[in-house]
């Protein structure tokens, strides 16, 4: 950033790095919990039509896939990676891709991913080896 750009940055709204760039809040898919047809696939689209601007600049995109004996749901939200989500630490929060990791939960199959590129939780990946292919 040129020197004329003010160094004063409200950390609740924006953040800055050592190179002088300013971080605006991320754009993420944000449909909360929705029923999903994503099952036994290497990758899926979220089918969430809502793109939200996260409240804080450090928040990242998150997707949570859950399957139990009743249904399959996909949750898409923004979340602060410093805080746990559903009791789990957000791994790979700086990743450009949302690569699902299984978490141990009683009574259901539970996968979660986090990423930090705009709308990156729109395309969720269950098999890292297929990250270059298009969604099923």
């Amino acid at each position: 950033i040129p020197p004329h750009v003010p160094k004063s940055v409200n950390s609740d709204v924006m953040a800055s790095d050592n190179g002088g760039a300013v971080k605006l809040p991320q754009l993420c898919k944000f449909c909360d919990v929705r029923l999903s047809t994503c099952d036994n696939q290497k990758s899926c689209m979220s089918n969430c039509s809502i793109t939200a601007i996260c409240e804080k600049p450090h928040e990242v995109c998150v997707a949570v896939w859950r399957k139990n004996d009743k249904n399959i749901t996909l949750e898409t939200v923004c979340h602060d990676p410093k805080l746990t989500y559903h009791g789990f630490t957000l791994e790979d929060a700086a990743s450009p891709k949302c690569v699902m990791k299984e978490k141990k939960r009683a009574g259901e199959t539970f996968f979660m991913c986090a990423c930090n590129m705009e709308e990156c939780n729109d395309y969720i990946i269950f098999s890292e080896e297929y990250t270059t292919s298009s969604p099923d």
Partner: nanobody
């Protein structure tokens, strides 16, 4: 060299309108998201609006939603901000900024244009 040059600021009465422009050069404008960010006197930076590279998807801070409209003309390498129903609290220096890599980091800024809303 990347350059962003804002224009269109000035003094306007409350309830009035202004249209800001930002002429871009030195990069492939149509490939990058752009944003308007402002700084009110004595305050920190506040993001105002953001537009995707395709010009279709737009986003606004709650404080300007319904009053401001962001747009772009990729054939003219120009970003716009139409500001209607201006309020005293909209008084600020307005900067246009270029996204670095679709990750929310904006790395190039213009010199800014001052908008003063006062009667």
């Amino acid at each position: 060299e990347v350059q962003l040059l804002e224009s269109g600021g000035g003094l306007v009465q409350p309830g009035g309108s202004l249209r800001l422009s930002c002429a871009a050069s030195g990069f492939t404008f149509s490939e990058y998201d752009m944003a308007w960010v402002r700084q009110a006197p004595g305050k920190g930076l506040e993001w105002v609006s953001r537009i995707r590279s395709d010009g279709v998807r737009t986003y606004y801070a709650d404080s300007v939603k319904g009053r401001f409209t962001i747009s772009r003309d990729n054939s003219k390498n120009t970003l716009y901000l139409q500001m209607n129903s201006l309020r005293a609290e909209d008084t600020a220096v307005y900067y246009c900024a270029k996204d670095r890599a679709k990750n929310g980091w904006f790395d190039y800024w213009g010199q800014g244009t001052l908008v003063t809303v006062s009667s």
